[in-house]
Interface confidence: low
């Protein structure tokens, strides 16, 4: 009963001329022991002789002959379970039908696997994600539905003709169900990666190029901005005017809305490539940039930190603390808004100035009656000089002095 | 319990439009991606189109490209198909349909009937 | 070009096994696949994804009397104990984006009849 003959291999194997290939199989005949093994080439059942033509790649026999092809064809099987084959080197004309002929004491079989066995080394195919996104891992698959134990290959990735720094995972298959090699690539692409190359190159053992599969990356990114200003140190005085221009290096998709940010805030209706400040005042100092939006998310250019100068404003004293005790220490401190910070400063003590103190604080160790009054200060910058603030009081409390009784 | 409804579907002549809509609810609607695919009467299964978690991604058949725009609303958990200059080979039950794992089409809606005849 | 190829129809008799096939293009032979159960009149049910070592996840609700496995380009199908609720097209299906373009192919479809 032919039906108890179970084979289990690949349907078709594929290879190239001057390779090899290497057939798993397995099988099982529940009457005994395999006793003639005949591995045929394109077989073809002769009903006149109840036998099969065909060109005999293999023969193990009781009688011991052995045909021509033996050295190049390996039965590596066993007499009842193993039926695994090996072909180096593999030649086109070997594509076509393999005929495994099997007959133990009572039973006869024939199986056939197919062979395809191409002239040149066949390309590998490369598996893309169907989304890929700036900075997401994502795993690229190289697969070769080839794998042979005679003939090592590697498959190796290249961006842009140059080989990948990421380590890649190569795997083998060579089992009843399946013969493949393949190559899964952990990368995490960044926007500058869109409309690159990637190819996953087949290489025999020694890197010698056998073909290839290429694929062109399709990076979704936020919009990549480039900020530029006039004037370019982004420094300018009140009342000068700024010209500030976004460019989108790379938006991929298209982006779709623009806007201005100061300090984080969005600026009203300005939604153009360019922003105009005209006339500008001190508080539009602050740090700037462009957003601009794709449906990946937004994309911010750096930022510019534009410095409105200006000369010092009036400025305030402040007295830490007053009223004072005789004895006491004090400090003074010059508070007045500019830019550049000032560089002098004039102190002012009831209204005459006080000599060798051009610092920001005025510190008196040790304060004494006569040191009560108004203080007042001027701060300088290189834009000018700013407006004497009206001053603050120092009250200095003492016992009393020279008691006279009248 | 996940649950894609459609609806929109209707009789139009060729050359008009109708939009269809599916509503989504019983899972997190902005993770996954969405598909549309349809099935003309006595017909396989066609893919139509394809759009991504953020709509980042969109993708549509060679047949109806130019003609068909999918978006998603994903505040309002729902998917549509904007579909212009309808043909009478448009014609067909269209299905909302999630994908999850590598290209798992992993839930069905019932599907909207859309008719093109003069 | 990716291509999936299923035997129009077959016929099982009830509580028997029941195995489909579906084919990929050759160069495809690797890749992932999807099953899918429409009954008449009703959406496609997600039945699993099928990896080619034969590893697979079923969908929701999907008896386990149904299973996967694979050989080569082959992906099957395999029910056991097959009742009459499982009379129904089954249908396989499989995604890829090749260069820009993402493209998702069906096979023709096996329609299942159990009889008894």
């Known amino acids: 009963d032919s039906s108890k003959w179970v084979f289990e291999h690949p349907e078709t194997l594929y290879a190239w001329e001057g390779a090899c290939v290497w057939i798993p199989c397995t099988y099982r005949a529940l009457d005994g022991d395999l006793e003639s093994f005949i591995l045929f080439h394109n077989p073809e059942y002769n009903k006149n002789t109840s036998k099969f033509d065909g060109t005999r790649l293999y023969e193990s026999t009781k009688d011991g002959k052995v045909p021509s092809e033996q050295k190049r064809v390996q039965f590596l099987g066993d007499k009842n379970k193993n039926c695994t084959l090996s072909i180096h080197p593999v030649h086109l004309n070997d594509s076509g039908q393999l005929g495994l002929r099997m007959e133990s004491k009572t039973e006869k079989w024939m199986e056939r696997i197919h062979l395809n066995v191409s002239e040149r080394p066949f390309p590998p195919h490369i598996q893309l994600p169907p989304e890929i996104q700036e900075s997401q891992e994502v795993t690229l698959t190289c697969l070769l539905n080839f794998s042979c134990y005679g003939y090592p290959i590697q498959l190796q990735w290249l961006l842009e003709g140059v080989p990948m720094r990421q380590a890649a995972v190569t795997s083998t298959s060579l089992t009843i169900k399946s013969v493949f090699t393949r190559s899964e690539l952990k990368f995490s692409p960044q926007w500058s990666h869109h409309g690159k190359i990637v190819t996953c190159q087949l290489q025999d053992a020694d890197g010698k190029f056998l073909s290839n599969d290429t694929v062109q990356l399709n990076v979704k990114h936020t919009p990549k901005l480039e900020i530029k200003v006039t004037p370019s140190d982004a420094i300018v005085r009140e009342g000068d005017s700024v010209t500030m221009t976004c460019e989108v290096s790379s938006s991929n998709p298209e982006y779709t809305t623009v806007s201005w940010l100061k300090d984080g805030t969005s600026l009203k209706k300005q939604n153009t490539f360019t922003l105009n400040l005209r006339e500008v005042t001190k508080d539009q100092s602050g740090k700037y940039c462009c957003q601009v939006s794709n449906d990946v998310g937004p994309g911010r250019s750096e930022e510019v930190f534009l410095q409105v100068q200006y000369a010092p404003e009036p400025s305030t004293v402040q007295i830490l603390h007053s009223p004072a005790v005789e004895g006491s220490q004090v400090e003074f401190l010059c508070m007045s808004l500019a830019n550049p910070l000032p560089t002098n400063y004039t102190w002012y003590h009831n209204g005459k100035e006080m000599q060798g103190r051009t610092e920001e604080k005025v510190h008196i160790p040790k304060i004494l009656p006569w040191h009560a009054g108004t203080y007042s200060c001027v701060a300088e910058n290189i834009l000018g000089t700013g407006q004497r603030g009206p001053g603050a009081e120092l009250d200095v409390q003492y016992p009393p002095k020279k008691v006279t009784t009248v | 319990e996940v649950q894609l409804v459609e609806s929109g579907g209707g009789l139009v002549k060729p050359g008009g439009s109708l939009k269809l809509s599916c509503a989504a609810s019983?899972?997190?609607?902005?993770?996954?991606?969405m598909n549309w695919f349809r099935q003309a009467p006595e017909k396989g299964l066609e893919w139509v189109a394809y759009i991504s978690r953020g709509s980042h991604t969109i993708y549509y058949a060679d047949t109806v490209k130019g003609r068909f725009t999918i978006s998603r609303d994903n505040a309002k958990n729902t998917l549509f198909l904007q579909m212009t200059s309808l043909r009478s080979n448009d014609t067909a039950m269209y299905y909302c349909?999630?994908?999850?794992?590598?290209?798992?089409?992993?839930?069905w809606g019932q599907g909207t009937s859309v008719t093109v005849s003069s | 070009q990716l291509v999936l190829t299923q035997s129009s129809s077959a016929s099982f008799s009830l509580g028997a096994s029941a195995k489909l096939t579906c084919t990929l293009s050759?160069?495809?032979?690797?890749?992932?696949i999807e099953w899918y159960q429409q009954q008449p009149l009703k959406p496609p049910k997600y039945v699993m994804e099928l990896k080619k070592d034969g590893s697979h996840s079923t969908g929701d609700g999907i008896p386990d009397r149904f299973s996967g496995s694979s050989s080569g380009a082959d992906r099957y199908l395999s029910i056991s104990n097959i009742q009459p609720e499982d009379e129904a097209i089954y249908i396989c299906g499989v995604g890829d984006t090749i260069k820009e373009q993402f493209v998702y192919v069906f096979g023709g479809g096996t329609k299942v009849t159990v009889l008894g």
């Open positions: 019983g899972f997190t609607f902005s993770d996954y991606g």
């Open positions: 349909v999630r994908m999850a794992g590598y290209y798992a089409m992993d839930y």
């Open positions: 050759s160069q495809h032979s690797s890749y992932i």
